[in-house]
């Protein structure tokens, strides 16, 4: 296993509709064909996969059907979006990127993007 | 597990055509990619073409307009439609199966270009 640097923002502030973009970005340093991208949440000391992705280079991302991730890749970008965020989940997302094939196996982990999540206040009854 | 079954490899003359086949069975995830891999003796494994469940599809550039990717989502098959084939083209095909959860390899089928 081979280390490999991958970069994302420090900071990013989800929408009022609970979805929030970032765009992870790795060093490749040789012509992966496959590659994974993992999104790891950190709180509280404690990590949790959020969601994974493979893809073909040049093709889109493959998520599991039921994931709160969506994506798109760009050379060596990958631009991952998260819906359905809450107050509640706001917290360091971590991106974790494998070149898969061919071998070397690569490996690089980001110092992780810290989205806060804002509930929308409900809106006040209106007069009208 | 999957395993994947290529066919229709054999020998052709240059500018002919030939239409690969590879079916998927077993634990088959809802969602994956399936693309073809070729290798000449002596050179390294090199991705054709790929395609996506939803039907996105990409080719390398020594294949575009000449080759073309597709799949039957139903069959769990996807097939590789070689046009104007090339000596260069000769090589051994690999089907690739990769989705989140796994990746698995077909045996290879030998295609030859040959007069």
């Known amino acids: 296993c081979k280390a490999m640097h991958v970069a994302q923002p420090a900071v990013v502030l989800a929408s009022s509709r609970g979805i929030a973009s970032f765009v992870c970005e790795y060093a490749s340093p040789g012509k992966a064909t496959e590659v994974r991208v993992t999104v790891l949440r950190q709180a509280d000391s404690q990590v949790t996969e959020v969601c994974a992705a493979t893809y073909m280079m040049g093709n889109e991302l493959t998520f599991l059907d039921d994931s709160i991730c969506t994506g798109t890749s760009s050379g060596n970008q990958v631009n991952l979006t998260i819906q359905g965020l809450r107050a509640m989940d706001t917290g360091l997302y971590i991106c974790k990127v494998e070149l898969m094939y061919p071998p070397p196996y690569y490996l690089g982990i980001g110092n992780g993007t810290q989205i806060y999540v804002i509930d929308p206040e409900p809106c006040p009854d209106s007069d009208f | 597990q999957v395993k994947l079954e290529e066919s229709g490899g054999g020998l052709v003359q240059p500018g002919g055509s030939l239409r690969l086949s590879c079916v998927a069975s077993g634990s088959i995830d809802s969602t994956y990619t399936m693309g073809w891999y070729r290798q000449a003796p002596g050179k390294q494994r090199e991705l054709v073409a790929s395609i996506t469940s939803s039907g996105s599809t990409n080719h390398a550039d020594s294949v575009k307009g000449r080759f073309t990717i597709s799949r039957d989502n139903a069959k769990n098959t996807v097939y590789l439609q070689m046009n104007t084939l090339k000596p260069e083209d000769a090589a051994v095909y690999y089907c690739?199966?990769?989705?989140?959860?796994?990746?698995?390899w077909g045996q290879g089928t030998q295609v030859t270009v040959s007069s």
């Open positions: 690739r199966y990769l989705s989140v959860l796994s990746a698995y």
